[in-house]
Amino acid sequence: TQNKALPENVKYGIVLDAGSSHTSLYIYKWPAEKENDTGVVHQVEECRVKGPGISKFVQKVNEIGIYLTDCMERAREVIPRSQHQETPVYLGATAGMRLLRMESEELADRVLDVVERSLSNYPFDFQGARIITGQEEGAYGWITINYLLGKFSQKTRWFSIVPYETNNQETFGALDLGGASTQVTFVPQNQTIESPDNALQFRLYGKDYNVYTHSFLCYGKDQALWQKLAKDIQVASNEILRDPCFHPGYEAAVNVSDLYKTPCTKRFEMTLPFQQFRIQGIGNYQQCHQSILELFNTSYCPYSQCAFNGIFLPPLQGDFGAFSAFYFVMKFLNLTSEKVSQEKVTEMMKKFCAQPWEEIKTSYAGVKEKYLSEYCFSGTYILSLLLQGYHFTADSWEHIHFIGKIQGSDAGWTLGYMLNLTNMIPAEQPLSTPLSHSTYV
């Protein structure tokens, strides 16, 4: 008789990342019989929802259902119908919604309520929509990259307790940059975490981890730009803002009402004699860098050492994976190679920012001008944040690895979030047998 392939015994999970600038849907897949193994869950689909982040729907909540339709329908196609009802769906909203909640808890709740009602209409097992904390965002990003890198697997041969990976089990730190916040998470070396708010204790696969994490709200790349503009316009002599963070020849109009719409610019708010101002790019990396540094208050630190704004930061330790916008921006700038020194990155940023806007538009004809215009700022901001904000040095720069995906799964908080909510990361090391390390593809 002919051998018939047995039906795949797999499970699926869906996580929606409702970020400040957009929403992405991720579909994960894993073999049902290996739920507690490390590294078996992998991403099979990413669907970027067309449009802005959900916080922008505050005045048009009735449009949220349509907004989510395409990607939810894509999930319907990718996941076999027989598994729809048992596939969990989670939506986590990040800093964009944290900011909206700061402005109005009622408006944030209304957006989430409509999101929940929309997602409940699908045949999946909807598990709720919530605003995750900055601490969770940092922690789940750290879990994701270390899970994908195999750092949690205490790989032991089934017949002995001698690990065959000896020098490779030190976890990676996680550096995440979004539009509205940025997270830094790592295991410090024998260092007391002086601030309890920044301390996390995990027991994963039989090992204890004391993890430092902090999320800097308003220090994502988009909100940092709004902050910088709000700070700089304070001292402008008229409605022309000559801005070193934009290419020479670049011009754009900014509404003052838009500038002060976000809670992130409140500290710079003042009455201006105009409703609109014009940015005129002058493309000077050094001046842009100096302007960005003014966003980091380093004059006050109640701990042995701080990042900025009085936030405790232990000495950096080990390798770091830098993902999300850290990766997208540096990839665009062709600066993701590990061997590109910090000095070379700075040199290349100087050259890039100094290029005339018309030249840039011609060189990158396929890129939307809105995004294209901000790479000089974003690249400079990344350098400033990593060097002056987090205290990386020219030497430790080579320990930063700009990562988009690992084993085909996006680096970011969503996988860690799902692993946690589906109880797929055991506290103790599962008992392994000779067969338990067969590989799933």
């Epitope: 689909e45 990413e46 390798d319 590990e338 061997k339 080579e398 320990h399 995906k405 085909g408």
Partner: antibody, heavy 118, light 108 residues
Framework: PVQLQQPGAEVVMPGASVKLSCKAS????????MNWMRQRPGQGLEWIGE????????NSNQRFKGKATLTVDKSSSTAYMQLSSLTSEDSAVYFC???????????WGTGTSVTVSS | EIVLTQSPTTMTSSPGEKITFTCSAS???????LHWYQQKPGFSPKLLIY???NLASGVPTRFSGSGSGTSYSLTIGTMEAEDVATYYC?????????FGGGTKLEIK
């Protein structure tokens, strides 16, 4: 299973061009970079370049600038490498390989043997 | 570019012996970017070890890797006849990605 399929052989005239294909299956094509390598008879491996199928972003070995052009067709999960102005020096086996973080190549194609001969 | 030098070029060994291949880099490499492959005549290369010491899927545990900086090694704990092949190290640390010249393992 994860597979990269390449045609077995191509015979081309000097000065001509050839477009090599590499069809991916068993994984999400846009989730991994695709790399191309050259191996001349009895020689070691040389890296030609890589392409990210999600956004067509490429990195190339300067040695192959003007010689190799990398493209992808997402709809058919196929990567291509066009080799131009071929000479006998280009006679080799060309492999495609999937790349992962750390830039290692975990899945390799079967290789296409290119012979440049008149 | 980073040049990887493998030594020796050819090695002859008997089944049951422990074998070590070395790979020396012209400049320091972070251990996350050094990998090893096995290639048998007429076949495609096969990933053996990735990120210095991680065993690739389906590779026997007699293979192991170690090293840091500019010096890396691949060890076969107990050689078997099927291990006859050429072994290459490769770096992904900088562009262009480069391979060592290979070490050919022959059986005595």
């Amino acid at each position: 299973p994860v597979q990269l399929q390449q045609p077995g052989a191509e015979v081309v005239m000097p000065g001509a061009s050839v477009k090599l294909s590499c069809k991916a299956s068993g994984y999400t094509f846009t989730s991994f970079w695709m790399n191309w390598m050259r191996q001349r008879p009895g020689q070691g491996l040389e890296w030609i370049g890589e392409i990210d199928p999600s956004d067509f972003y490429t990195n190339s070995n300067q040695r192959f600038k003007g010689k190799a052009t990398l493209t992808v067709d997402k709809s058919s999960s196929t990567a291509y490498m066009q080799l131009s102005s071929l000479t006998s020096e280009d006679s080799a086996v060309y492999f495609c390989a999937r790349g992962d973080f750390g830039w290692y190549f975990d899945v390799w194609g079967t290789g296409t043997s290119v012979t440049v001969s008149s | 570019e980073i040049v990887l030098t493998q030594s020796p070029t050819t090695m002859t060994s008997s089944p049951g012996e422990k074998i070590t291949f070395t790979c020396s880099a012209s400049s320091s490499i972070n251990s996350n970017y050094l990998h090893w492959y096995q290639q048998k005549p007429g076949f495609s290369p096969k990933l053996l070890i990735y990120r210095t010491s991680n065993l690739a899927s389906g590779v026997p545990t007699r293979f192991s890797g170690s090293g840091s900086g500019t010096s890396y090694s691949l060890t076969i704990g107990t050689m078997e006849a099927e291990d006859v092949a050429t072994y290459y190290c490769q770096q992904g640390s900088s562009l262009p990605r480069t391979f060592g010249g290979g070490t050919k393992l022959e059986i005595k």
